[in-house]
């Protein structure tokens, strides 16, 4: 197990997950850790505890390893970090990777007010409701970009979009969370259509899909530890 020293001089590795940071309960996920060509050992930590290690074979000139989680559960959802060793030196910790398990307990309802087809500039609000009491809701847009908001609440959340632009058009789903890394089943998708403006933008986004596997997530982490372009709004309502 890695010993903490003050002389951790090796650059930190990069950590990411495939196919996604969001994994359906019972499904598998790969966690990749990329360090250095000279690395003799990689260690993966979960919630601060030693989780797994890999010693690359000398014959394989690789600067990354793959850790395989065969069945994602609420017990394997949370924050992962990795380290690598080269010679006598250990690297600094990677940025945190936040793995979420979905498909737990219940399915929320998602709807949009005033309606799914609106004109450019009209005010739109998404509502997500989950019968099982929860404290936080997440709204995700397929092929979305990074946008995170927070509120606290109970069985329903509001996601005010304000005056919509063409960038808001697309297909949305919501989740209720039982903790930050354990989420409900996804809601049924709701597609927001925008009409009006210079060009008719009423068409749904190209290649819409109901499969989470097609959602575009950038699975690396930025300096603050947040997922970059993770395509979710984090919303909790206040009652």
């Amino acid at each position: 197990q890695r010993i903490n020293t003050e002389k951790e001089t090796l650059p930190k590795p990069i950590i990411w997950a495939k196919p996604s940071i969001m994994v359906t309960n019972g499904n598998s996920v790969n966690i990749w850790c990329q360090g250095a060509q000279s690395a003799s050992e990689y260690q993966l930590y979960f919630e601060g505890s030693f989780f797994a290690l890999e010693r690359p074979k000398p014959s394989r000139s690789m600067n990354k390893v793959r850790f395989f989680i065969s069945q994602m559960t609420s017990h394997t959802a949370g924050i992962y970090t990795c380290f690598y060793q080269s010679g006598e030196l250990w690297s600094k910790s990677s940025n945190p990777l936040k793995l979420v398990v979905t498909g737990l307990y219940d399915t929320p309802n998602l709807w949009v007010y005033p309606r799914p087809e609106v004109t450019l500039g009209e005010n739109v609000t998404f509502f997500c409701q989950l019968k099982t009491a929860t404290s936080k809701f997440f709204l995700l847009k397929e092929r979305g970009s990074n946008h995170i908001q927070n509120k606290y609440g109970n069985i329903q959340a509001e996601f005010p979009m304000g005056p919509v632009t063409r960038a808001h058009r697309g297909t949305y789903r919501c989740f209720g969370s039982y903790n930050d890394y354990a989420w409900s089943f996804p809601s049924e998708p709701v597609t927001l259509l925008i009409t009006g403006g210079v060009e008719n933008s009423s068409l749904a986004p190209t290649d819409p899909t109901s499969s989470l596997d097609y959602w575009e997530f950038d699975l690396s982490t930025n300096e603050s530890g947040l997922q970059k372009d993770s395509a979710f709004w984090d919303h909790t309502t206040q009652n």
């Epitope: 790969n30 979960f46 989780f51 797994a52 010693r55 074979k57 793959r66 850790f67 395989f68 065969s70």
Partner: nanobody
Framework: EVQLVESGGGEVQPGGSLRLSCAAS????????MGWFRQAPGKGREFVAA???????YYAESVKGRFTISRDNAKNTLYLQMSSLRAEDTAVYYC????????????????????WGQGTLVTVKP
Amino acid sequence: EVQLVESGGGEVQPGGSLRLSCAASGRTFASAAMGWFRQAPGKGREFVAAISRSDDTYYAESVKGRFTISRDNAKNTLYLQMSSLRAEDTAVYYCAAVVPTYGNNIYVHSAAYNYWGQGTLVTVKP
């Protein structure tokens, strides 16, 4: 579905030896990463040793140099050779598997394992 059955537990004096076995059903054993955990009376489950698909091993500091983990893929069996046993080694020993797995992964955390045996009791006393 993988089934794991441990055997070889029993009572032994301090300084003595035992060999635990874990028989796995199914044809997935060779593609599994395996581990041994133990739970002493009134304590939580703790990691003992683990082995990758390609026989790379890792041990808890408390057993390093005394215990040896090995596997026989032809017999679908995992072993834990225990020597220089101490009173603090008294526990129920569990065999666990990660199926499937990849490459040379060695799993240390119990949450990684998706199949568990029922356990076999090892008692070390004079």
